[in-house]
Structure formats: structure tokens, C-alpha cells
């Protein structure tokens, strides 16, 4: 069956060190826990997480993203899931694109993340 | 199963505070949007505002900004709606209501509401 | 703040009949629209989201349709539990808001 991919319409922001969570679904939801679920990072495809045959594929990861990332699967049977990201850091900031595999039909959706230094501030005056 | 369990029913007089509580169980509470709604006796639903309990911020409906306070304890899975300057017009049941991050795709469980009376 | 309009207010059926409720968003808000089914003393119940897909359980009776600015619900053949009234909310502003409800009744 078809389904369309929906992340988040505006930019998350993170700041340094914090983690962040990446949301994504599919429309109409339906149990996603056989397809193919991941995240990687445009223009490259550097993959940021894979999960796959009911397993997360730690194998696959780009280096910057091993035990840093997270999929949360509490919704994954109406098709929601989470990324969750440890640790942020500046190289973090910029594109993402989930995507959905059920057999050979896959939709995708591109979001944005804003990282921002904890420490920076203006002085007054 | 994800429940959805509301505070019970308040009495307050005019010009006093009322504070609602949601507790939420069976799934990952910061991850989720929790909204309160409420209907006064033989009217509509009326979203007042919510909050990303992962982001911790809330947004309020214009006509209740400065008069609502929307907040989450994560480590209690619980959410909270504080209603101060009561008035009669705010007569009615406070609902909570779950969904997806920035409060998108609806709102797929609910709270069984809690019934607000202001009189004096 | 983005107005939802229901139309009509009230409706007045029989169990067998098509039944099609309409809201207009005074905004474009794409498909980001819900449908929500309350019977008294209830809270809602979650029937449609992103105008045209079905929350799981609902029976396939309800349909969603509609983009822009005009949406639809539709019954294609009212039973006596769907007897309600029908409320539309939008989420493409994160300031939601509802239409005022459709209350369908037994002719």
C-alpha cells in the first residue's frame, strides 16, 4: 500500500551537548515495524540510523553517529517513530531525511536542524 | 494502552486559579504533544493551548495568552493547565488531549476531562 | 488565528442515508485537518487525520476528503451509533483551532 512520509514543517533547534529528538510518520499510519526506517544525511546519504528486519543496523552507521543515536518505537505500530540524537554538536546542524521501505515502495521526507551554542550571549548595552 | 488520567472536578470563585493535572502512562510522554481543550455547557471545543514536553515551551490561544500557564514534569509523565482571573464564562470541562510532535495529526487519545465551576 | 466554518449546524438523518458535513478553513492549511466524532458527556474521539486518513478502528464507513481551504466527511451509510456531532480542527497553525461542530440527529 501507498503512504506519504511526514517530518516536522519547521526547523527543530538543539543546543550543544543536549539531544534531540527527529519525528516522522507515514499517512495513512500502519504497523512500520517490518519496513525499512532510517535517516541519513543529504547531500551524501551518510546514514545517521537504520533499522531494518525488526533491528536497529548499527553496522551501516556513518562513524560521527555510532551510540549516539536512538530509534524510538513506543508508535512504530501506527507508523511514528523518533530519532533521537545524543550528544549534539554543531556538525549536526543542517539537513536530514527519514525515510519509509515497505517491500519496494519507499517515501521519504526532509527536515532541519538548528544547533545552537549554550554559552553565547550578548552582553547588554 | 495509552491513558490519559485527568485531575477531579474543581468549585472556585470568581478571580481565583485553577490548576489541572493529565498524567499520562504507556507511552513515551516528552515525545509527544499534550494539548487542553475545553467545552463550556452546550458549546464547542475550544483548544486553549500546549505544550512538547521535549521541548519544554507552550503555545497558548490568543484569547486565553497571560491568563493560562501550560506546563510538564517528564519525570512524572504528567502535564499541567493553570487558569487564573476566573471568571463565570470559564464554567466547563477541561479536557487533555495527546498528539503527535507540534501538535500534528490530530488528537489521538484523550483525557476523560475534568469539570470546572466558577461560582460565587 | 486560522477560522474553521462547519456547515450545516445541525443535520437531520435517517439510519441508511449519506451524510457529508463540509468546513472551510479561511486559510489555505494544505491537508492538515482532522475530524473528531463527541457524543454527550464524552470526550472526542479522533475519526480522520491529514483530511483523508483513517484513524485505526474507525469503521471504513467514514471518509475524509479535501485540500486548500474545503474539506469534507463523509458517512456513506449512517448507523444509529454515529449519531454526534462532528468537529473539525486544523493543525497547520500551531495555534489549532476548531470549527463550531455539526450535530447530526434522527430525522
Known amino acids: 500500500g501507498q503512504f506519504r512520509v511526514i517530518g516536522p514543517r519547521h526547523p527543530i533547534r538543539a543546543l550543544v551537548g543536549d539531544e534531540v529528538e527527529l519525528p516522522c510518520r507515514i499517512s495513512p499510519g500502519k504497523n512500520a515495524t517490518g519496513m525499512e526506517v532510517g535517516w541519513y544525511r543529504p547531500p551524501f546519504s551518510r546514514v545517521v540510523h537504520l533499522y531494518r528486519n525488526g533491528k536497529d543496523q548499527d553496522g551501516d552507521q556513518a562513524p560521527e553517529y555510532r551510540g549516539r543515536t536512538e530509534l524510538l518505537k513506543d508508535a512504530i505500530g501506527e507508523g511514528k517513530v523518533t530519532l533521537r540524537i545524543r550528544n549534539v554538536r554543531f556538525s549536526d546542524e543542517g539537513g536530514f531525511t527519514c525515510f519509509f521501505r515497505d517491500h519496494s515502495y519507499q517515501e521519504e521526507a526532509a527536515m532541519e536542524l538548528k544547533v545552537e551554542d549554550p554559552f553565547y550571549w550578548v552582553s547588554p548595552g | 494502552q495509552v491513558q490519559l488520567v485527568q485531575s477531579g472536578a474543581e468549585v472556585k470563585k470568581p478571580g481565583s486559579s485553577v490548576k489541572v493535572s493529565c498524567k499520562a502512562s504507556?507511552?513515551?510522554?516528552?515525545?509527544?504533544?499534550i494539548s487542553w481543550v475545553r467545552q463550556a455547557p452546550g458549546q464547542g471545543l475550544e483548544w486553549m493551548g500546549g505544550i512538547i514536553p521535549i521541548f519544554g515551551t507552550a503555545n497558548y490561544a490568543q484569547k486565553f495568552q497571560g491568563r493560562v500557564t501550560i506546563t510538564a514534569d517528564k519525570s512524572t509523565s504528567t502535564a499541567y493547565m493553570e487558569l487564573s482571573s476566573l471568571r463565570s464564562e470559564d464554567t466547563a470541562v477541561y479536557y487533555c488531549?495527546?498528539?503527535?510532535?507540534?501538535?500534528?495529526?490530530?488528537?489521538?487519545?484523550w483525557g476523560q476531562g475534568t469539570t470546572v465551576t466558577v461560582s460565587s | 488565528d486560522i477560522q474553521m466554518t462547519q456547515s450545516p449546524s445541525t443535520l437531520s438523518a435517517s439510519v441508511g442515508d449519506r451524510v457529508t458535513i463540509t468546513c472551510r478553513a479561511s486559510?489555505?492549511?494544505?491537508?492538515?485537518l482532522a475530524w473528531y466524532q463527541q457524543k454527550p458527556g464524552k470526550a472526542p474521539k479522533l475519526l480522520i487525520y491529514?483530511?483523508?486518513s483513517l484513524e485505526s478502528g474507525v469503521p471504513s464507513r467514514f471518509s475524509g476528503s479535501g485540500s486548500g481551504t474545503e474539506f469534507t466527511l463523509t458517512i456513506s451509510s449512517l448507523q444509529p451509533d454515529d449519531f454526534a456531532t462532528y468537529y473539525c480542527?486544523?493543525?497547520?497553525?500551531?495555534?489549532?483551532?476548531f470549527g463550531q461542530g455539526t450535530k447530526v440527529e434522527i430525522k
Open positions: 480542527q486544523q493543525y497547520d497553525s500551531p495555534l489549532l483551532t
Open positions: 486559510q489555505s492549511i494544505s491537508s492538515w
Open positions: 488531549a495527546r498528539g503527535w510532535y507540534f501538535f500534528d495529526a490530530g488528537f489521538d487519545y
Open positions: 504507556g507511552g513515551t510522554f516528552s515525545s509527544y504533544a
Open positions: 491529514d483530511a483523508s
